[in-house]
């Protein structure tokens, strides 16, 4: 029963984390415009991965898309990248999953397969957690060094009387969207693969059985043998269940509140 | 047609208060910013404040911060401004302008204007 | 606060020729996020309220005569009238539109010569 829950739970916590990270990845604001230097601004910018956007104090929001693939930096390509291969094995570990839900009954899938799919759609939603996580601290990492090499040429005087007031960009909502949705996945995919040790049948080992040959009296150990040995043994294969007790170590628990700089 | 017509002029004494009414017709009055500007005889245009009708929300110029405030009621249409301790410097053509959505932050309409004239 | 300057303070041009008005601005007025410049340009005929002619530096407003032009970008703007009518003798002012407060220029009163 505990297996089911943890592997069910695990389950819907991927779903979230996963959600969360396709909707991070489509967002428009993954940078915002810095307002501490400029909090009179009447036109606010703000970035994604895809496009800028600008909105206007009338609410006009005009949006363009990077109609440019070469002309990108590579690190945009590299956080895009990870947050697609984030997504795809987020959905393959979601499908995969699906029919390794306990719950469900699909022809006469072994409790084994089930096993093997949940520890693959674990690995799976880990990766993808990890993807996720990564991509976002890549950008956020490429906000904090421009942010910095723009406090330090921050007014370009022009004779000393006409600024340019360069623009400075700050963690948008996706940044956060994507690191909370990240770590969902990864702890779903944990979940999965502790619900996987909970299905795997473990194999038996049998006791020492005697053999009488006809005549003598000497009995036979063959302890080391296990039943695939096919000593005549009578007793049956038992598959055996871990009925899903978990130690303090292994209790999974939602992340406390994270305090943002 | 887009319509602003504001009421008619006041003659104020030092330290009075005058509320100016700026009546908004021919459009969805909540779907735009309305901004005041004003204009002293034979000077220049100032920037007093804008209010957004559909929250109430309000940002005004540092000089006139504590002695403006800008209101609306959306019964009917309409947005006031209310210039507190008046000066002779406050003598003044004030303004409401409807802050147009694709105008670039631009002032596409504009009311015809209120006098007030602060004298003692 | 932005400070606005426009040059000349007054103009006289005759019909039919070009009158140019130049505005300066103390910061950019150029937005990076969309490359466009938050500059308007109004018109002040005597006892009546502005009227937008130019905004986004370059982009007429509906209805105004296309002899109204404006450039620039960044900092230094240029309203030009290309074929001076009689009913454009007014006041100019141009105005920057990209920070809180919203401010204007002084004002250039176009005159026929």
């Known amino acids: 029963m505990a297996v089911t829950a943890c592997q069910g739970l695990g389950f819907v916590v991927s779903l979230i984390g996963i959600a969360g990270i396709i909707a991070a990845t489509c967002m428009d604001q993954w940078s915002t415009q810095d307002l501490y230097n400029n909090p009179v601004t009447a036109v606010f910018n703000y970035q994604g991965l895809w496009r800028s956007c600008v909105r206007e104090s009338s609410g006009f929001t005009e949006c363009r898309g990077y109609f440019t693939l070469l002309g990108l930096p590579a690190m945009l390509q590299a956080v895009r990248a990870l947050m697609i291969v984030g997504i795809v094995l987020g959905a393959i570990g979601l499908l995969v999953s699906i029919f390794a839900l306990k719950c469900i009954r699909i022809g006469s899938m072994e409790d084994s397969a089930k096993a093997n799919m949940t520890l693959t759609s674990g690995i799976m939603f880990i990766v993808s957690g990890l993807c996720a996580i990564a991509g976002v601290s890549v950008f956020a990492n490429m906000l904090v060094t421009n942010f910095w090499m723009s406090t330090a040429n921050m007014y370009t005087g022009m004779g000393g009387m006409v600024q340019t007031v360069q623009t400075r960009y700050t963690f948008g909502a996706a940044l956060f969207v994507g690191w909370v949705a990240g770590g969902l996945t990864l702890i779903g995919g944990v979940m999965m693969c502790i619900a996987c040790r909970g299905l795997a049948p473990e194999e038996t080992n049998y006791k020492a059985v005697s053999y009488h040959a006809s005549g003598h009296s000497v009995a036979y150990k063959p302890g080391g043998f296990k039943a695939s040995t096919g000593f005549g043994s009578n007793t049956k294969n038992k598959k055996i269940y871990d009925g899903g007790a978990r130690t303090e170590d292994e209790v999974q628990s939602y992340p406390s509140k994270h305090d943002y700089v | 047609e887009v319509q602003l017509v504001q009421s008619g002029a006041e003659v104020k004494k030092p330290g009075a208060s005058v509320k100016v009414s700026c009546k908004a017709s021919g459009y969805t009055f909540t779907s735009y910013i309305m901004h005041w500007v004003r204009q002293a005889p034979g000077q220049g245009l100032e920037w007093i404040g804008y209010i957004n009708p559909y929250n109430d929300g309000t940002k005004y110029n540092e000089k006139f911060k504590g002695r403006v405030t800008l209101t609306s009621d959306k019964s009917t249409s309409t947005v006031y401004m209310e210039l507190s301790s008046l000066r002779s410097e406050d003598t003044a053509v004030y303004y409401c302008?409807?802050?147009?959505?694709?105008?670039?932050?631009?002032?596409?309409?504009w009311g015809q204007g209120t006098l007030v004239t602060v004298s003692s | 606060d932005i400070v606005m300057t426009q040059s000349p303070d007054s103009l006289a041009v005759s019909l039919g020729e070009r009158a140019t008005i130049n505005c300066k601005s103390s910061q950019s007025l150029l937005n990076s996020g969309n490359q466009k410049n938050y500059l308007a340009w109004y018109q002040q005929k005597p006892g009546q309220p502005p009227k937008l002619l130019i905004y986004g530096a370059s982009t007429r407003e509906s209805g105004v005569p296309d002899r109204f032009s404006g450039s620039g970008s960044g900092t230094d703007f240029t309203l030009t009238i290309s074929s001076l009518q009689a009913e454009d003798v007014a006041v100019y002012y141009c105005?920057?539109?990209?920070?809180?407060?919203?401010?204007f220029g002084q004002g250039t009163k176009l005159e026929i010569k």
């Open positions: 302008a409807r802050l147009g959505f694709t105008t670039r932050n631009a002032m596409d309409y």
């Open positions: 105005q920057n539109d990209h920070s809180y407060p919203f401010t």
